[in-house]
């Protein structure tokens, strides 16, 4: 029986800038229960905070809620594992809201076959920004990418569409049914996870660009 | 609606020992940092302890360190001051407060008033 | 510990008219800084935290500013229940400390 091992904090993330949720791994138990807590105090201040909610994140997380996240301030947290032989901390983690967002998928992605009479056929789409992101603030610049494959191919086909929520795509492969996905990020921050696949019958006549 | 209710107030002679209580109901009690802040005429407003969620920070006023001792019972929504060894000067009216933003109390008790006085 | 000091302790000032409360504290708290009402027989309410944050509820014209050291409550047009005590706090350090109070009386 031993004090347990070092606990490590691996990952924080943010959907929104407005609330935040950070996650640990445990060390080794010591053959023993073993306790955990997440402790921080924000940069400038030497109060300690203990973290205010260990279930909404799930097994061995803390979630901060929108009267304890601050865009504008580092935190620096720890975790301290307890069990009847002893103590161990992780290490130190800095924390920046700003840097640690990761939105929700965009939605309502929608995926049309246009063919203009005086122009060659294109794939048409479009989306809409993630619910909890308000764009309005301007604390926020979302950019967008989106992939495309057929539907049995292996490799997908991945286009940059900066900050707009509309896009085309000239070249495909008439006759096939192709899935298409967006994901987007913000500025200082992590891709989203992708959205849902939409699919799309491309028709047979479809011209393909030069 | 949020509602902290204290209790075990009274009057007692120098030496003696008082136990408070708060009541919280109307928010999640186990979620958050509560504290203890006493008012008197002659010194105003005294923070004298702080008790984290699951009571792994706690904090005491020098004047109050060795003869008080803040805890919490999640399970029952209360808060608890046992003060021991009292002296005349921690006469004041004792609030509970909490609901915090970051350490600050948005909700406060109206308070009990402590006597000490032989 | 942190001394904080509230300039004046009291201001006489008449319904819709500015006020303006200062406290100075004895070393940096940096933004970790708050603003307390309190009226006779209640406890104190929170104003403002984080040196500029307005509270759940509380009106518009009450606003804060400052960092450091220097701290500034204004309330842009007194009602009649504005007339109170108010209170500065910090709470950057421990033990946290508040000012001995401004009393807003009317004139």
């Known amino acids: 029986q031993l004090p347990p091992g070092k606990p490590e904090i691996f990952k924080c993330r943010s959907p929104n800038k407005e609330t935040f949720t950070c996650w640990w791994r445990p060390g080794t138990d010591g053959g023993l229960p073993t306790n955990y807590s997440l402790t921080y105090h924000r940069e400038g201040e030497t109060l300690m905070h203990e973290c205010p909610d260990y279930i909404t994140g799930g097994p061995n997380s803390c979630h901060f809620g929108k009267q304890y996240t601050s865009m504008w301030r580092t935190y620096v947290m720890m975790v301290n594992a307890t069990n009847q032989m002893g103590s161990s901390f992780s290490d130190e983690l800095y924390v920046d809201v700003t840097y640690i967002v990761q939105p929700d998928p965009p939605l309502e992605l929608t995926v049309e076959v246009k063919q203009p009479e005086d122009r060659k056929p294109y794939l048409w789409m479009k989306w809409s920004p993630p619910t909890l992101i308000d764009l309005k603030t301007g604390w926020f610049t979302l950019l967008y990418e989106i992939r495309l494959k057929p539907e049995k191919a292996a490799e997908w086909e991945t286009h940059f569409a900066g900050q707009q929520t509309e896009f085309k795509i000239l070249s495909l492969h008439p006759g096939q049914k192709y899935l298409v996905q967006v994901r987007c990020k913000p500025d200082h921050g992590y891709w989203s996870a992708w959205s849902p696949a939409t699919f799309i019958q491309i028709p047979s006549d479809f011209i393909m660009n030069d | 609606e949020v509602h902290l209710v204290e209790s075990g107030g009274g009057l007692v002679q120098p030496g003696g020992s008082l136990r408070l209580s708060c009541a919280a109901s109307g928010f999640t009690f186990s979620s958050y940092e509560m504290n203890w802040v006493r008012q008197t005429p002659g010194k105003g407003l005294e923070w004298i302890s702080h008790i984290s969620s699951r009571s792994v920070i706690i904090y005491y006023a020098d004047s109050v360190k060795g003869r008080f001792t803040i805890s919490r019972d999640n399970a029952k929504n209360s808060l608890f001051l046992q003060m021991n060894s009292l002296r005349a000067e921690d006469t004041a009216v004792y609030f509970c407060?909490?609901?915090?933003?970051?350490?600050?109390?948005?909700?406060w008790g109206q308070g009990t008033l402590v006597t000490v006085s032989s | 510990e942190i001394v904080l000091t509230q300039s004046p302790a009291t201001l006489s000032l008449s319904p819709g008219e500015r006020a303006t409360l200062s406290c100075r504290a004895s070393q940096s708290v940096s933004s970790y800084f708050a603003w307390y009402q309190q009226k006779p027989g209640q406890a104190p309410r929170l104003l403002i935290y984080?040196?500029?944050s307005r509270a759940t509820g509380i009106p518009t014209r009450f606003s804060g500013s400052g960092s450091g050291t220097d701290f500034t409550l204004t309330i842009s047009s007194l009602e009649p229940e504005d007339f109170a005590v108010y209170y500065c706090?910090?709470?950057?350090?421990?033990?946290?400390?508040f000012g001995q109070g401004t009393r807003l009386e009317i004139k």
């Open positions: 984080d040196a500029s």
């Open positions: 407060a909490g609901i915090t933003i970051f350490g600050i109390p948005e909700y």
């Open positions: 706090q910090q709470r950057s350090s421990w033990p946290i400390t």
